[in-house]
């Protein structure tokens, strides 16, 4: 008996061939001997089976001695043994229909779980193997689960169902809803405008939800909500914003926030959360702001940074085109009685400059000029 595997919702062609290469009488029946379809001369005739409106054949192939049964929009319950009667012979074909579906939605939040469920006909014992877009293989029986979805899990999952040494392939498109970056850091000189961007790692037709940026300033004892906003069909509207600082927000995606001035009291870290409509859980992106200030008070030239810096970052003070006068893994450095000239305050990581502030030191009788 020939075995054919089909996919739920798909179309399948069951073949039946006669030795004579001409149109002769044929009938297709199911295992209960109920007629599905056949011919009467050149006419296609249909029986009282439940397949009636989904069964078809190809007249053009009859003249070649081929009498296919085509079943459209396959259902699991179409799994059966189909019998083709032609030239006093019977050809049997066993059709097994499988379905593979994602547990809920195919749009899942980062960190959530994906469960794939296999629908199979009674009496079958299929095995399933799925390959994620990043090449990870998972195997299982009726259900397959992947916990803690990551951004790289977005894309087409290819699942192969094996039964009777035959296989059928399913492709399921999964979208992991997340920000492109889990965390970002912005380095700014005091007084500069700060731009925060929160690009999403996915695109959908309509995007609706609400969000909020909570900020924990380094100098503050508790965090504070800086802004709340709504997202409707990719249009952003601000609901509430603090007076200090007065953030501005772009009206279109990607989510974009502007802080008019980088000030030491704003240095710290924030957490932007985005709750999407009809989704449980939220998307998160951490953002950090490091602010630098270089000052000269009397005979003391000081450089300071505020905000979340790693212990391996180096803060230096140097006269332009000269060796660093002072260089420390600290958040403040200073030089007493600095020489006149253009001084540079540098925040660097393994030799790479992250932030730079210049201050002009004038001869001792005049006051300093800060560019």
């Amino acid at each position: 008996k020939k075995v054919v595997l089909g996919k739920k919702g798909d179309t399948v062609e069951l073949t039946c061939t006669a030795s004579q290469k001409k149109s002769i009488q044929f009938h297709w029946k199911n295992s209960n001997q109920i007629k599905i379809l056949g011919n009467q001369g050149s006419f296609l005739t249909k029986g009282p089976s439940k397949l009636n409106d989904r069964a078809d054949s190809r007249r053009s192939l009859w003249d070649q001695g081929n009498f296919p049964l085509i079943i459209k929009n396959l259902k699991i319950e179409d799994s059966d043994t189909y019998i083709c009667e032609v030239e006093d012979q019977k050809e049997e074909v066993q059709l097994l229909v499988f379905g593979l579906t994602a547990n809920s939605d195919t749009h899942l939040l980062q960190g959530q779980s994906l469960t794939l469920t296999l629908e199979s006909p009674p009496g079958s014992s299929p095995s399933v193997q799925c390959r994620s877009p990043r090449g990870k293989n998972i195997q299982g029986g009726k259900t397959l689960s992947v916990s803690q979805l990551e951004l790289q899990d977005s894309g087409t999952w290819t699942c192969t169902v094996l039964q009777n040494q035959k296989k059928v392939e399913f492709k399921i498109d999964i979208v992991v809803l997340a920000f492109q970056k889990a965390s970002s850091i912005v380095y700014k000189k005091e007084g500069e405008q700060v731009e925060f961007s929160f690009p999403l790692a996915f695109t959908v037709e309509k995007l609706t939800g609400s969000g909020e940026l909570w900020w924990q300033a380094e100098r503050a004892s508790s965090s504070k909500s800086w802004i709340t906003f709504d997202l409707k069909n990719k249009e952003v509207s601000v609901k509430r914003v603090t007076q200090d600082p007065k953030l501005q927000m772009g009206k279109k995606l990607p989510l974009h926030l502007t802080l008019p001035q980088a000030l030491p009291q704003y240095a710290g870290s924030g957490n932007l959360t985005l709750a999407l409509e009809a989704k449980t859980g939220k998307l998160h992106q951490e953002v950090n702001l490091v602010v630098m200030r270089a000052t000269q008070l009397q005979k003391n030239l000081t450089c300071e940074v505020w905000g979340p810096t790693s212990p391996k970052l180096m803060l230096s003070l140097k006269l332009e085109n000269k060796e660093a006068k002072v260089s420390k893994r600290e958040k403040a450095v200073w030089v007493l009685n600095p020489e006149a000239g253009m001084w540079q305050c540098l925040l660097s990581d393994s030799g790479q400059v992250l932030l730079e502030s210049n201050i002009k030191v004038l001869p001792t009788w005049s006051t300093p000029v800060q560019p």
């Epitope: 089909g6 996919k7 919702g9 798909d10 179309t11 399948v12 062609e13 001369g41 050149s42 006419f43 296609l44 078809d56 190809r58 007249r59 053009s60 003249d63 085509i70 079943i71 459209k72």
Partner: antibody, heavy 112, light 107 residues
Framework: QVQLQQWGAGLLKPSETLSLTCAVY????????WSWIRQPPGKGLEWIGE???????NYNPSLKSRVTISVDTSKNQFSLKLSSVTAADTAVYYC?????????WGQGTLVT | DIQMTQSPSSVSASVGDRVTITCRAS??????LAWYQHKPGKAPKLLIY???SLQSGVPSRFSGSGSGTDFTLTISSLQPEDFATYYC?????????FGQGTKLEIK
């Protein structure tokens, strides 16, 4: 909703080989036959040939010696090659899904 | 090959008119016939299959009849969007063949 999207070179010189591809989106690829049909300027429709997912083909005898239709099931695509073209092969070429009737059709590609 | 002959090759009519197009097969094709509507720059659209079955989404003003060698497409009340070229096609045997087309124009 099944959609067919086709592409290929639109301008050829005599004796060259015409090459077109049609991608099937959003529906079953197996169980159907996939056809190529053409319409020369100001003329009627002419069936070129067809293929199914397992590579079984049927061709119009008038073009059979020059036509090759192939299938790539991994991409849900099928292709047409027509060799030794002449000015008489200038037409809009369509791909279409078929059991007995052609539905749906691709958007058409003018090949000159 | 089975030859399909349509008549008339063109017809002028007005909105609201009833229009009939005929198609004749050179041999018996029982009910293995379809009708298509084709507008310039667009893909042909299946209207009627198996001689008289209305394709899903096609307005009920379109109807088909006939069996054997003679077939008819009828548009009961012409609408402005119906002005196009109409083709019949036989699916009885290879090669599939089409009629030469009937152009329906505004009077």
């Amino acid at each position: 909703q099944v959609q067919l999207q086709q592409w290929g070179a639109g301008l050829l010189k005599p004796s060259e080989t015409l090459s077109l591809t049609c991608a099937v989106y959003g529906g079953s690829f197996s169980g159907y036959y996939w056809s190529w049909i053409r319409q020369p300027p100001g003329k009627g429709l002419e069936w070129i040939g067809e293929i199914n997912h397992s590579g079984s083909t049927n061709y119009n005898p008038s073009l059979k010696s020059r036509v090759t239709i192939s299938v790539d099931t991994s991409k849900n695509q099928f292709s047409l090659k027509l060799s030794s073209v002449t000015a008489a092969d200038t037409a809009v070429y369509y791909c279409a899904r078929v059991i007995n009737w052609f539905d749906p059709w691709g958007q058409g590609t003018l090949v000159t | 090959d089975i030859q399909m002959t349509q008549s008339p090759s063109s017809v002028s009519a007005s909105v609201g008119d009833r229009v009939t197009i005929t198609c004749r097969a050179s041999q018996d094709i029982s009910s293995w016939l379809a009708w298509y509507q084709h507008k310039p720059g667009k893909a042909p659209k299946l209207l009627i299959y198996a001689a008289s079955s209305l394709q899903s989404g096609v307005p009920s003003r379109f109807s088909g009849s006939g069996s054997g060698t003679d077939f008819t497409l009828t548009i009961s009340s012409l609408q402005p969007e119906d002005f196009a070229t109409y083709y019949c096609q036989q699916a009885n045997s290879f090669p599939y063949t089409f009629g030469q087309g009937t152009k329906l124009e505004i009077k």
